[in-house]
């Protein structure tokens, strides 16, 4: 029986610059029941807080809500483990929201055929952006990335659509079913998971010649 | 012919874990999303979460948070879920689903009882 | 969380008659729906994606339409096959989510 052995906090993502969660990956257990807390303090300051809610998150979480949240200060935390032979501690670390965000996947990818008459046919696709992420304040910019493939593909085709929730593909294969994912990035930041995947069915007739 | 073969029938008892496997044939597991869903018994469909075998990423339902792990082992086509920390309320069918939702394995009973 | 809500829970017919199944969606889903079939024993089968697309041999009988948050799988007559469990399922965002299922139960 020993000292639990030392935590590590591995992550720390927001969804919208208003809210946050850090995660911690707990040391050895040392053979004895463990508990963990998490303390912070914001930087200038000398008072230590714990974890407002150890819940929302899920298993070694901390989940910091609007009210504990603030974009324009830097959070400096540790996790310290203890059981009945002793304590551990996390490095200290220091944690800006505003290069932490981490969007929700885009929303209501739409795929359609497009045939005009006078012009080559082409994949029209379109999305909306996360509905927690605020455009119209200003504070985001959104960047966007589609991915596509034929069904049994193991290779996906990428393309950057910039600001752009709309994006046109010429060349696809006819009769073929295309998977269709979007994802998104604020200037600061990290990619979102991946939209669950839209399908279509490009019908035979689909052409590709001028 | 796109096929998912899932392991046998389990019974366990509660606190324990299950692994249920999903071979692929037809496909490969690289191209190939998987979902899995679950379904007690005389209930509905619920999902629990997504593995996506090209980037190792996984998305799961909020309610298993912690206790669902999802993987794949390209080279025998093959997709894992496993639950852990069992309760009698997990006893249903688990399903292992193409990404497409029009392959879908033939079912997993997984019993939790004491 | 979208919830999805299916409407009736069973709908009695007659073989040979028309039957309207109703999924309604808490947000707007745009048209990432699809509606399936489950019969005792089995797995579920797709019939319908893309709110309004029928699966790979799936018959004509089967249509949907919808768009946003109101959705209808009519099947236009009734086969002694038909009579089974129908689920939609969203796959807008994550999580996705079934409907409670309506059973089409012989009249």
């Known amino acids: 029986q020993l000292p639990p052995g030392k935590p590590e906090i591995f992550k720390c993502r927001s969804p919208n610059k208003e809210t946050f969660t850090c995660w911690w990956r707990p040391g050895t257990d040392g053979g004895l029941p463990t508990n963990y807390s998490l303390t912070y303090h914001r930087e200038g300051e000398t008072l230590m807080h714990e974890c407002p809610d150890y819940i929302t998150g899920g298993p070694n979480s901390c989940h910091f809500g609007k009210q504990y949240t603030s974009m324009w200060r830097t959070y400096i935390m540790m996790v310290n483990a203890t059981n009945q032979m002793g304590s551990s501690f996390s490095d200290e670390l220091y944690v800006d929201v505003t290069y932490i965000v981490q969007p929700d996947p885009p929303l209501e990818l739409a795929v359609e055929v497009k045939q005009p008459e006078d012009r080559k046919p082409y994949l029209w696709i379109k999305w909306s952006p996360p509905t927690l992420i605020d455009l119209k304040t200003g504070w985001f910019t959104l960047l966007y990335e589609i991915r596509l493939k034929p069904e049994k593909a193991a290779e996906w085709e990428i393309h950057f659509a910039g600001q752009q929730t709309e994006f046109k593909i010429l060349s696809l294969h006819p009769g073929q079913k295309y998977l269709v994912q979007v994802r998104c990035k604020p200037d600061h930041g990290y990619w979102s998971a991946w939209s669950p995947a839209t399908f279509i069915q490009i019908p035979s007739d689909f052409t590709m010649n001028d | 012919q796109v096929q998912l073969v899932q392991s046998g029938a389990e019974v366990q008892k509660p606190g324990a874990s299950v692994k249920v496997s999903c071979k692929v044939s037809?496909?490969?597991?690289?191209?190939?999303?998987i979902h899995w869903v679950r379904q007690a018994p005389g209930k509905g469909l619920e999902w629990m979460g997504n593995?996506?075998?090209?980037?190792?990423?996984?998305i799961h339902a909020q309610k298993f948070q912690g206790r669902v792990t999802m993987t794949g082992d390209t080279s025998t086509d093959t997709a894992y879920m496993e639950l852990s920390s069992l309760r009698s309320e997990d006893t249903a069918v688990y399903y292992c689903?193409?990404?497409?939702?029009?392959?879908w394995g033939q079912g997993t009973l997984v019993t939790v009882s004491s | 969380e979208i919830v999805m809500t299916q409407s009736p829970a069973t709908l009695s017919v007659s073989p040979g008659e028309r039957a309207t199944l109703s999924c309604r969606a808490s947000q707007s889903v745009a048209s990432n729906l699809a509606w399936y079939q489950q019969k005792p024993g089995q797995a579920p089968r797709l019939l319908l994606y893309g709110a309004s697309t029928r699966a790979t041999g799936i018959p004509a009988r089967f249509s949907g339409s919808g768009s946003g948050t109101e959705f209808t799988l009519t099947i236009s007559s009734l086969q002694s096959e038909d009579f089974a469990l129908y689920y939609c399922?969203?796959?807008?965002?994550?999580?996705?989510?079934f409907g409670g299922g309506t059973k089409v139960e012989i009249k």
């Open positions: 399922q969203h796959y807008n965002n994550w999580p996705l989510t």
């Open positions: 689903v193409g990404v497409t939702f029009d392959y």
């Open positions: 037809g496909y490969t597991l690289t191209a190939l999303s």
């Open positions: 593995f996506d075998p090209g980037d190792g990423e996984t």
